[in-house]
């Protein structure tokens, strides 16, 4: 007994498609290894048709492919324009189709129903419109016209030009007689639903002289497209309902087990608090279409979703609607990082982002995500070294520490910055992360003078107490521009006994400005970290004055418990939209931090650190 | 509100066919997928046959022991499932289960895939 499993038999009609899917044990080995589909020949011999590997035969090219799900243990063929001579005996299997693991499937294509002569096949949609046409002869043009549907027997009247319409049609049908000349009336149908299906009647005149027309109606439920995306990272449900419903209000549902469909996001302004922080509905575009956008994708958001359209915001019968099969892969690509990072009023988080390692040259970016509506990203900082200007000289992205993640360094926190954040580059979509910044209570670990008034051409040192739990780690101050955080050079002092026993007074590393030139004026960021993770930063602002009295400025250390000013900035920058998350080099106009120019200056500064185990806390 | 009503069970001969029937109603039955189970006492529910319709196509899957010998229909229009049962053997006595699925996405073989159970029909093949 195979453990390879599908439908024994498929049987459909030609022109349309199926989708079979074929169950294995998901061990190892069975998801990694080739699925095939075959044909099984006179010979007894079992052509592959398509595979996992890429192939597809030519009789398939086009209208064939396998997708492979090894998180479900299942993958599904799908084969469209389907033709009498795809009946036949096939299967599908794992490994070599002599000698695989495989699973029978017979297929039977039909001719389908036998139709009158001359019958129009119309293929529409649920939801969307159908426009038939009926042609008649000059005589019949004063004549009635009229549409009937045919059940079984009988003909039930539909609509006609006595302004007739069956109540089950009401305000989604219209018949339309053109001017003199031309000889064809139609009928258009909105709102199509499953119950219009069938053979409908056209009718000019009456008596044996009338003209007639059959027409097919064919009205199908969207096939769901499979969506198979990785635990952690991110899915795009690109919605594309038509320009009939370009005004109307959009949705997104998910369907439950009642069958109902629970809104998930709509245009309205609702959202179903398990996506807080996670979604965005992207602006339409002219023709009504639009895109939803949920990351931090979790094992339970899988199921079938459907966008459509309605006044009020949710499913309802008759109008247009998409559907997609989301399942959720556990044994993702996307490494695990922290989804909340907590951090102290005053003080830092770090926030380590997972990208497309195979991506390194990519942009990266960070926003914040906000709930008003349906959902927006504004940028606030970018790897090319744009920042948005009220997080001038406390926020950065970091490079470090490569091959797949990159860090977000925010500080002098306050309880506004709580929130959800958005890690996100210009390249795989998939890789967009989420993660919550939480402000708890307790105090900053680093602590730095509030502000510091330098005097030209004289001696700066600003002190930075530790922990003795930052001990090991490696120390640094850095001068941060709209570019990053350039670190300092270091001076080492030599070793320091008291450190190795972490006395009080050795928990200190300083910086050095001297002769201190205008261009010191800025930010700097006292902070710690191991190897290529950063760790807390605290930050300082230098104001650069005039020379008033001789002598040296030293910052003393019993100052630098003092909180650091809070640095109030013009936050009237311009909205981004979150559309522009779609393609963050629509970022580009944003008002950006004019960069702070000289780097510090090179050798006139240096940072003293009473630490035995480090080079002055420089980053190599 | 879901309901599955089966009729059609009873007492045959090996060897014999019977049809079973499910009439559903309350769920949307040609997009649902629809399956016949069994159970003996002190055993778990065992999958017999499925079928699944999706646009003009129609997927039906059988359990190998019934392979050959059980055909699975349903009737759209009227929402009824059947299971034509032929070559009846001892072994087939149980109880017979409709059971509908309308997320269709889980595995047809697996019992807690289907949402919606009816209350079973009693079959029994004598030698």
């Known amino acids: 007994k195979s453990p390879v499993f599908g439908p024994q038999e498929v049987s459909s009609v030609e022109g349309n498609s199926v989708s079979i899917k074929c169950y294995y044990p998901p061990t190892s080995v069975n998801r990694h290894t080739r699925k095939y589909w075959c044909r099984k020949g006179a010979s007894g011999r079992c052509i592959t048709l398509v595979s996992s590997e890429g192939y597809v035969s030519s009789n398939y090219a086009g209208r064939a492919n396998l997708t492979n799900f090894p998180e479900n243990g299942t993958f599904v063929v799908n084969i469209a324009q389907l033709s009498r001579d795809d009946s036949g005996h096939y299967k599908c299997g794992l490994g070599i189709n002599s000698r695989g693991l495989s699973f029978d499937v017979s297929l039977e294509v039909s001719q389908g129903p036998e139709l009158p002569n001359g019958t129009e096949v119309y293929t529409v949609d649920v939801g969307r419109t159908v426009t038939i046409k009926c042609p008649f002869k000059t005589e019949n043009a004063p004549k009635t016209k009229a549409l009937y549907k045919k059940i079984g027997q009988t003909s039930v009247l539909v609509i006609d030009s006595r302004n007739y319409v069956n109540p089950n049609y009401k305000d989604r049908i219209r018949l339309r007689i053109p001017g003199t000349g031309q000889l064809i009336f139609t009928v258009v149908i909105d709102r199509l639903r499953l119950s219009d299906h069938g053979l409908y009647l056209c009718q000019a005149g009456d008596g044996s002289n009338r003209d007639e027309k059959n027409a097919d109606l064919q009205v199908l439920e969207p096939e769901p497209e499979l969506v198979y995306e990785d635990l952690r990272g991110s899915v795009t449900f690109h919605c594309a309902l038509g320009l009939e419903v370009a005004n109307v209000a959009k949705f997104l549902c998910r369907v439950n087990s009642r069958e109902t469909c629970d809104v998930v996001i709509n245009t309205l302004g609702k959202r179903d608090s398990a996506f807080e922080g996670r979604i965005l509905l992207n602006p339409q575009d002219k023709d009504g279409s639009f895109s939803v956008v949920i990351t931090g994708l979790r094992k339970e958001d899988e199921g079938r979703y459907l966008c459509g359209a309605h006044s009020d915001g949710q499913l309802q019968e008759g109008w247009p609607i998409q559907a997609w099969q989301l399942f959720v892969n556990e044994e993702s690509t996307i490494p695990r990082s922290p989804t909340v990072v907590k951090g102290v009023a005053g003080g830092s988080v770090a926030v380590l982002c997972p990208y497309n390692p195979k991506e390194s040259q990519s942009l990266k970016y960070w926003c914040l995500w906000e709930g008003a509506q349906n959902g927006r990203c504004p940028l606030l900082v970018e790897s090319q070294g744009l920042v948005q200007e009220q997080y001038e000289g406390r926020l950065s992205l970091l490079q470090e520490p490569g091959n797949g993640t990159f860090t977000v360094i925010l500080n002098q926190l306050t309880t506004q910055d709580a929130g959800f954040y958005w890690c996100l580059t210009n390249g795989d979509t998939r890789w967009r992360t989420t993660v919550e910044i939480k402000i708890i209570e307790g105090e900053p670990n680093l602590k730095v003078p509030g502000n510091v008034t330098a005097v030209l051409g004289e001696t700066l040192n600003i002190p930075c107490h530790f922990p003795c739990k930052f001990s090991s780690y490696e120390k640094y101050w850095c001068k941060w521009s709209n570019t990053g955080c350039q670190t300092l050079p270091s001076q080492d002092e030599g070793p320091s006994e008291a450190f190795v026993n972490c006395d009080e007074n050795s928990r200190l590393v300083s910086l050095t400005l001297n002769p201190v030139t205008r261009a010191d004026e800025g930010w700097y960021w006292c902070g710690v970290k191991q190897g290529h993770f950063y760790g807390e930063t605290a930050a300082v602002y230098v104001a650069v004055e005039e020379k008033k009295v001789a002598g040296s400025r030293y910052v003393s250390p019993a100052k630098a418990d003092a909180a650091p000013d809070e640095k109030v900035l013009d936050s009237g920058v311009r909205e981004i939209e979150n559309k522009a998350i779609q393609d963050p080099r629509l970022f580009a106009e944003e008002k950006v931090v004019a960069d702070t120019g000289d780097q510090a200056g090179g050798s006139r500064a240096s940072v003293d650190s009473s630490s035995s185990e480090e080079q002055g806390g420089s980053s190599k | 509100e879901v309901q599955l009503v089966e009729s059609g069970g009873g007492v045959v001969q090996a060897e014999d066919s019977l049809r079973l029937s499910c009439a559903a109603s309350?769920?949307?039955?040609?997009?649902?997928?629809m399956g016949w189970f069994r159970q003996v006492p002190g055993k778990e529910r065992e999958f017999v046959a499925a079928?699944?319709?999706?646009?003009?196509?129609?997927?039906?899957y059988y359990d190998d022991s019934v392979k050959g010998r059980f055909t699975v229909s349903g009737d759209n229009a009227k929402n009824t499932l059947d299971l034509q049962m032929k070559g009846l053997k001892p072994e087939d006595t149980a109880v017979y289960y409709c059971?509908?699925?309308?997320?269709?996405?889980?595995?047809?073989?697996?019992?807690?895939?289907?949402?919606?159970w009816g209350q079973g029909t009693q079959v029994t093949v004598s030698s």
């Open positions: 079928i699944g319709w999706s646009g003009r196509s129609t997927y039906r």
């Open positions: 059971a509908a699925d309308p997320n269709y996405y889980g595995d047809v073989r697996t019992s807690g895939t289907y949402q919606y």
């Open positions: 309350g769920l949307p039955f040609s997009s649902s997928r």
